[in-house]
Amino acid sequence: MMTGTIETTGNISAEKGGSIILQCHLSSTTAQVTQVNWEQQDQLLAICNADLGWHISPSFKDRVAPGPGLGLTLQSLTVNDTGEYFCIYHTYPDGTYTGRIFLEVLESSVAEHGARFQIP
């Protein structure tokens, strides 16, 4: 039985050219996390495997950085990055848990200034 829940950073409005951190946290389960996939609209951005570590998809290498933790840092944001991002936790024995975050990237004059800065 899957008892866990995923908590996310919540939806984010950010500024073009800035950077943001996407994070998910799996709680309320003792299941072992074997791998976390980060995806956007059916595109794989990155994988964090418990044994093999991080793999960033080649097409995102310049703008995606691993961490902090199992999270993902997106840099040099463009308006085209607007969309839904998924953290997919593969666990044993529970199976798969998915968290969702919607990121809105706006021209500089519109976005909230707070999203320019990374979480300490």
Partner: antibody, heavy 119, light 112 residues
Amino acid sequence: EVQLQQSGPELVKPGASMKISCKASGFSFTAYTMNWVKQSQGDNLEWIGLIVPYNGGTSYNLKFKGKATLTVDKSSSTAYMELLSLTSEDSAVYYCARGLQRFFAMDFWGQGTSVTVSS
Amino acid sequence: DVVVTQTPLSLPVSFGDQVSISCRSSQSLANSYGSTYLSWYLHKPGQSPQLLIYGISNRFSGVPDRFSGSGSGTDFTLKISTIEPEDLGMYYCLQYTHQPPTFGGGTKLEIK
């Protein structure tokens, strides 16, 4: 003046599919998200999903995944929602609503499209 | 999904009254950057819903200053300082911090 003009009321048979349109005017269509909301008989409102006209990206309420398909035609500044395999549970008023930039709210709404599913 | 609970379900009023509507969420609506995406809408019969308040406390363009929003975390309130006839209808809060966005069940503001 910001306007969202939706297509007219529909009476459809169970099992059929249909498409509602939402024509935007008075603003830059690709600079905003477009949300779709269902209002059922009991007055409750449910978020169906949204589409990003700029890149075609979508986000769905999992409850409506497979029931609703969202698309846009940038050339005519029109958003569409197709409803599939209709049942009586889908009888409702459907609204399109523009996303308020920065604050994740819905600032302008279409007039609503009433859908009745009946044999 | 985040559950949003609105109280009361029905609010009988007289013109000139001051009223409050409460909205509670099952988890905090503050995102990791400190922004809270909680908005309020008025839905009048035969019309489309209209945005009143966004980001907890910001009045939308053209909304009279008798409407005010407050709150933080999981607890939010819409206040109407002096009820006028055009204020009657269904009020909804909406959380848009977590996917999917979820509405409260609504509060019907009606004449006593």
